[in-house]
Amino acid sequence: EEELQVIQPDKSVLVAAGETATLRCTATSLIPVGPIQWFRGAGPGRELIYNQKEGHFPRVTTVSDLTKRNNMDFSIRIGNITPADAGTYYCVKFRKGSPDDVEFKSGAGTELSVRAKPSAPVVSGPAARATPQHTVSFTCESHGFSPRDITLKWFKNGNELSDFQTNVDPVGESVSYSIHSTAKVVLTREDVHSQVICEVAHVTLQGDPLRGTANLSETIRVPPTLEVTQQPVRAENQVNVTCQVRKFYPQRLQLTWLENGNVSRTETASTVTENKDGTYNWMSWLLVNVSAHRDDVKLTCQVEHDGQPAVSKSHDLKVSAHPKEQGSNTAAENTGSNERNIY
């Protein structure tokens, strides 16, 4: 009779993570008598996957009934496959011996490859906010995928970005892989409503890529522009001065009025108006009692935005002596030449 051969018909098997792998093995003869064992790897360090004779193998089931006398099918199923299960599996026939069974013949091996989906991409931006015209870096990470081939793209508001660097790790063979990409984005004043998207495509996703997003509202700081104007006289001895704070983001803003360098009033932006581009406007006014001043008054609107160094704008209010008119001995001039902006 022809000598027993161990046949592993599949050179390789590809299984998705979480599914069951079937590793096929048949013997060409019932002789010699003895059990079958399955191993992962070759050499002394090989790992026991299934032993027909003894042991506890909760994830392994046999395809056929190995207790039947004429059985020659030694195929197994391994449940709930993970990338860590990848490797070459050998079906090995042992000859019954005393005290120990003796290895008789091995199959050629079946390489199990595991397809695993990448995790949802996580996009993170810089730790500190940046202002328009600055370049900021965003990172995108996704883990646990196999095989190694993967495509990553960056978008800003639907437009593909080109300035990025991507690494897939590790370089060598591994049970699963990770991808890390860093993209550079130039901020503009209109980016409060913008989004940066990292898109990952992998064979396991069947053409439906995974996306991770970051809102530039978390990253951008748009500094305000200030304008101080003097309104027409409200009453004989009162002047209304307004400070227009325009196009700022985020909302966190504190404004201080100074009269000749002395703090007059401090307030926090509350009832702001939102612009179409997501930035905010706010207005503060100061009622100046002209009769309380003998000399000209320098009014300063000082704004501290989002914890940044204060910016300010000043306005000179001229207080001049006039002949008594309608019971008033001082007047506030409101001519263009009396206004001066100081940064």
Epitope: Q37, F39, R40, G41, A42, G43, P44, G45, R46, E47, L48, I49, G55, H56, G87, D100, E103, P170, V171, G172, E173
Partner: antibody, heavy 117, light 108 residues
């Protein structure tokens, strides 16, 4: 968590015997090969012996015929019987779990064997 | 028996710097080369196997390269905890599993 704990080291005279044990936990002991590696004081690592899942044994030439590796799967314990000990056997003996890639992924903290007259 | 020769014997590096050391095999081992790290009074720890595959939980700053007889371990930016002795080991399918003599990485 995988744990390997060696015991049985000590001071012996040349020619005497010692039996080292390594208690394993945190993995299915029967499914993996296990090995002994030693390190003489101030020296590098030297592989000593390995026992496969099927009980096949392998030895370094320096210990062949004097050392015997064995395993008790029911106790998840690895042993190294050392006979005819020599001064050059003085070392810290580590046991380690062997992966199917034939590398040693988990190690015990070691047990010191000193052979001196 | 395959003999592994590591060089240099000692490497002095400042924290944050790149460290590269090599392992040469007396005959080809394909890609079957592993790297271990050992700190004083501790057991060795598996870093890399199959020449360039990082073991579970090993940081990305460790990378291995090479095949045949020439291999390199690189630590891209040395951290204080990386100062140790590094050993290479060939893990072809049959014993003896030989180790290199080690490279000590010390603080400059």
């Amino acid at each position: 968590d995988v744990q390997l704990v060696e015991s049985g080291g000590g001071l012996v005279r040349p020619g005497e015997s010692l039996r080292l044990s390594c208690a394993a936990s945190g993995f299915t002991f029967t499914n993996y090969a296990v090995t002994w590696v030693r390190q003489a004081p101030g020296e590098g690592l030297e592989w000593v012996s390995l026992i496969s899942v099927t009980g096949t044994t392998y030895y370094a030439d320096s210990v062949k015929g004097r050392f015997t590796i064995s395993r008790d799967n029911s106790k998840s314990t690895l042993y190294l019987q050392m006979n005819g000990l020599r001064a050059e056997d003085t070392a810290v003996y580590y046991c380690a779990k062997v992966t199917w890639k034939n590398v040693f992924d988990y190690w015990g903290l070691g047990t010191l064997v000193t052979v001196s007259s | 028996e395959i003999v592994l020769t590591q060089s240099p014997g000692t490497l002095s590096v400042s924290p944050g710097e790149r460290a590269t050391f090599s392992c040469r095999a007396s005959q080809t081992v394909g890609s079957k080369l592993a790297w271990y790290q050992q700190k004083p009074g501790q057991a060795p720890r598996l870093l890399i196997y199959d020449a360039n595959t990082r073991a579970t939980g090993i940081p990305a700053r460790f990378s291995g390269s090479g095949s045949g007889t020439e291999f390199t371990l690189t630590i891209s930016s040395l951290q204080s905890e990386d100062f140790a002795v590094y050993y290479c080991q060939q893990h072809t399918d049959w014993p003896p599993y030989t180790f290199g003599g080690g490279t000590k990485v010390e603080i400059k």
